[in-house]
């Protein structure tokens, strides 16, 4: 039959950061193509990435409809040039993905320090509120919009002239910290979702130091 050399997809893996979500799998196709389907536990299957020779499929548009739902995907394998052909049981070969709950599992992207402003012995450090692909009322929501108080940021800061670090946490996107007058400080932030058990922390933001462009100083 035409399915003799068709192999099922394997190693189905969700790759998701700030809700941008791609399903990846193996193997690279040889004389076969793939179609992906996705559904919620209680929903209908929706087909995506029809008859593709890629080994990835962007499912962001589907998962952002409700990031708190749990999704399942499956990858169908068809013989190239004969996509109507079915497997021995009368249906195409397919493999299921692990379940994926975006709200609980999407990786937190590397944050960015938007600005810092010194007024006397206080510095206000602001973290950029990154836009996600999650929509509400035709507008894209920010990370803070989606996670609310579930999202905190940890700030690490230190004098440029010394190695001793301090830390602070915020449940907004701003820190107000005390500094020594006349000293330059460096800053790095990390996003955290403390209620999670996996993918809890982002990587650190790039380090920003006073005396560089992002800062502002007022007596």
């Amino acid at each position: 039959s035409g399915t003799t050399n068709t192999v099922a997809a394997y190693n189905l893996t969700w790759k998701s950061t700030n809700f941008k979500t791609i399903l990846e799998w193996e193997p690279k196709p040889v004389n076969q193509v793939y179609t992906v389907q996705i559904s919620t536990k209680s929903g209908d299957w929706k087909s995506k990435c029809f008859y593709t020779t890629d080994t990835e499929c962007d499912l962001t548009d589907e998962i952002v409809k409700d990031v708190k739902q749990t999704y399942l995907a499956r990858v169908f394998s068809y013989p190239a040039g004969n996509v109507e052909s079915t497997g021995s049981a009368g249906e195409p070969l397919y493999e299921n993905s692990p379940e994926f709950t975006p709200y609980l599992e999407t990786n937190l992207g590397q944050p960015t320090i938007q600005s810092f402003e010194q007024v006397g012995t206080k510095v206000n450090v602001t973290v950029e509120d990154e836009r996600t692909l999650v929509r509400r009322n035709n507008t894209f929501l920010s990370l803070r919009d989606v996670f609310g108080k579930d999202l905190i940021y940890t700030l690490y800061y230190w004098k440029s002239s010394s190695s001793g670090k301090k830390t602070a946490k915020t449940n907004t996107n701003e820190f107000l910290i005390d500094v020594d007058k006349g000293e330059n400080y460096c800053f790095s932030v990390q996003a955290v979702i403390p209620s999670r058990t996996v993918n809890r922390k982002s990587t650190d933001s790039p380090v920003e130091c006073m005396g560089q462009e992002k800062g502002e100083f007022r007596e």
Partner: antibody, heavy 117, light 107 residues
């Protein structure tokens, strides 16, 4: 389940150093922050410092800065605290604790360090 | 550094009593406040996190409230196993600071 297992009791001479350990199981230490807390006999709790094993950032209470070093070995899920220039006031139980971001939610059983000549 | 003032330092109460312990921070700690129970010769145990949330396995007679600089731990009906020392901890910024502790004794 989550466990923090600390090393055994230590007797040390004044002026020397001790290094105590805390082996974590049931979670990945890189996903959390790890801290050390001191409790002298009959006294309250005192934060010494903490570490983010994911990036190596360590923070210390200024009272201990320069005498304490906190490190983490992610390959063995172990956190260490080294305290140098020991004095009698360092006689205490030392606890390691996991910080979720919301609280120190799990604690080790404590390590008694006795400083005596 | 942020100072945590915990009161009272000790109290005597009977089984069934309602007990309230307070912690006042020297500046806004944005709810990064947790409460711990410690019994003699034992490690502290987490009771309340993020000012108001009950830790896993903790009886519902324990509750936390407050925001900004003022926080409260309440035990609605004291049980025999609740006689212990209680500590608050601010972890909004380093150095983290504990309250001085409240010893709850049997009247």
């Amino acid at each position: 389940q989550v466990q923090l297992l600390e090393s055994g009791a230590v007797l040390a001479r004044p002026g020397t150093s001790v290094k105590i350990s805390c082996k974590a199981s049931g979670f990945n230490i890189k996903d959390y922050y790890m801290h050390w807390v001191k409790q002298r006999p009959g006294q309250g709790l005192e934060w010494i410092g903490g570490d983010d094993p994911a990036n190596g950032h360590s923070m210390y209470d200024p009272k201990f800065q320069g005498r304490v070093t906190i490190t983490a070995d992610t390959s063995t899920s172990t956190v260490f605290m080294e305290l140098s220039s020991l004095r009698s006031e360092d006689t205490a139980v030392y606890y390691c604790a996991r910080d979720s971001g919301y609280a120190m939610d799990y604690w080790g059983q404590g390590t008694l360090v006795t400083v005596s000549s | 550094d942020i100072q945590m003032t915990q009161s009272p330092s000790s109290l005597s109460a009977s089984v069934g009593d309602r007990v309230t312990i307070t912690c006042k921070a020297s500046q806004d700690i944005k709810s990064f406040l947790s409460w711990y129970q410690q019994k003699p010769e034992k490690a502290p145990k987490s009771l309340i996190y993020y000012a108001t949330s009950l830790a896993d396995g903790v009886p519902s007679r324990f509750s936390g409230s407050g925001s900004g600089t003022d926080y409260t731990l309440t035990i609605s009906s004291l049980q025999p196993e609740d006689f212990a020392t209680y500590y608050c901890l601010q972890h909004g910024e380093s150095p983290y600071t504990f309250g001085g502790g409240t010893k709850v004794e049997i009247k």
